[in-house]
């Protein structure tokens, strides 16, 4: 690495993956092992994140980018950058302080995380229940009874509908 010769801040020429070493006359030095700098002109390198315990490494740390973690099987990420791991539950359950519990009647959860949510109330849209809900699945709404012609074997979903029972978790 060459000594920087900038008329302004000599450190501005230090690229990502290096730091401006004040102890060595502001020479651009490579980041030490297990550290990184994602932008140029930095005076220190940041310590790499370590994915330990319930976290596992999704992307290794490099000299220019931090490690990225996800969760071991049976857990899922929460928070920005997977800052926490939370236990998975089965579909039809929600996580409580006492562990995974089945959804109460009239609620469902089609995910391995998140809470049990009430079934859709089809009548709010003037529609009828086409398929009953379960603890794993929401009800399916169909056209209003008045829309059904005699002998109609099936109906289409109400206007554009929303997607799988995913609710933000």
């Amino acid at each position: 690495f060459e000594r920087t010769r900038s008329l302004q801040d000599p450190c501005s020429n230090c690229p990502a993956g290096t730091f401006c070493d004040n102890n060595r006359n502001q020479i651009c030095s490579p980041c030490p092992p297990n550290s990184f700098s994602s932008a140029g002109g930095q005076r220190t390198c940041d310590i790499c994140r370590q994915c330990k315990g319930v976290f596992r490494t999704r992307k290794e740390c490099s000299s220019t980018s931090n490690a990225e973690c996800d969760c071991t099987p049976g857990f899922h990420c929460l928070g920005a950058g997977c800052s926490m791991c939370e236990q998975d539950c089965k579909q039809g359950q929600e996580l409580t302080k006492k562990g995974c519990k089945d959804c109460c009647f009239g609620t469902f959860n089609d995910q391995k995380r998140g809470i049990c949510r009430p079934w859709t109330n089809c009548s709010l849209d003037g529609k009828s229940v086409l398929v009953n809900g379960t603890k794993e699945r929401d009800v399916v709404c169909g056209p209003s009874p008045a829309d059904l012609s005699p002998g109609a074997s099936s109906v289409t979903p109400p206007a554009p509908a929303r997607e799988p029972g995913h609710s933000p978790q």
Partner: antibody, heavy 127, light 110 residues
Framework: EVQLLESGGGLVQPGGSLRLSCAAS????????MSWVRQAPGKCLEWVSV????????YYADSVKGRFTISRDNSKNTLYLQMNSLRAEDAAVYYC????????????????????WGQGTLVTVSS | QSVLTQPPSASGTPGQRVTISCSGS????????VTWYQQLPGTAPKLLIY???HRPSGVPDRFSGSKSGTSASLAISGLRSEDEADYYC???????????FGCGTKLTVL
């Protein structure tokens, strides 16, 4: 009538980036889940990502996690897919798809399927 | 390889009834709704069946869907030449936290 128009496809080198857009009309965009689905030439359909309108919650296929980012601008009726670190296996026609089941009344849209599709935009990844 | 298994091809003569299967597991088909799509050559997919067995308006009643356990089926009766297309099953998979498609069945009308 539901209309979805994708754009932004093209030729990009491995490791490069592209941003796809999908302009929606003919329905209340802010009330529906939206997905990207791709299809490599002569291959199967592969779901890529979904975004919900209410909470902005997103899900991704394992094959694109950490590289692709789905987003939406409800004020512009537009869906986006930012694709970084592109690989040869990402080459495909990318479709924008609208889910059935309008929110917030409908709690889950999985039952209703993807009831509106764009014509697709071709992404080629080659050096 | 797809999480949902479909036969790669199926065929029939005009007027016949053909059935296309889709096999999965308890984390997808077993506990979630199945949808079916038709993709005519050179076009985008079109929703054919939702919520296991229901047709959107405009889809002929020659198309029907059913589900039992961790498998689903699409039946097409009174086969027509315009039914020649690729047919895909799809559902939500809670363990993957994502949608999954079968790899499609190419239907040929002989």
């Amino acid at each position: 009538e539901v209309q979805l128009l994708e754009s932004g496809g093209g030729l990009v080198q491995p490791g490069g980036s592209l941003r796809l857009s999908c302009a929606a009309s003919g329905f209340t965009f802010s009330g529906y889940d939206m997905s990207w689905v791709r299809q490599a030439p002569g291959k199967c359909l592969e779901w890529v990502s979904v975004i919900y309108p209410d909470d902005g919650n997103t899900y991704y296929a394992d094959s694109v996690k950490g590289r692709f980012t789905i987003s939406r601008d409800n004020s512009k009726n537009t869906l986006y897919l930012q694709m970084n670190s592109l690989r040869a296996e990402d080459a495909a026609v990318y479709y924008c798809a609208k889910h059935g089941g309008q929110k917030p009344t409908t709690k889950s849209s999985s039952a209703y399927g993807m009831d509106g599709w764009g014509q697709g935009t071709l992404v080629t990844v080659s050096s | 390889q797809s999480v949902l298994t479909q036969p790669p091809s199926a065929s029939g003569t005009p007027g016949q009834r053909v059935t296309i299967s889709c096999s999965g597991s308890s984390s997808n088909i077993g506990n979630n709704y199945v949808t079916w799509y038709q993709q005519l050559p050179g076009t985008a997919p079109k929703l054919l069946i939702y919520a296991d067995s229901h047709r959107p308006s405009g889809v002929p009643d020659r198309f029907s869907g059913s589900k039992s356990g961790t498998s689903a089926s699409l039946a097409i009766s009174g086969l027509r030449s315009e039914d020649e297309a690729d047919y895909y099953c799809a559902t939500w998979d809670y363990s993957l936290s994502g949608y999954v498609f079968g790899c499609g069945t190419k239907l040929t009308v002989l």
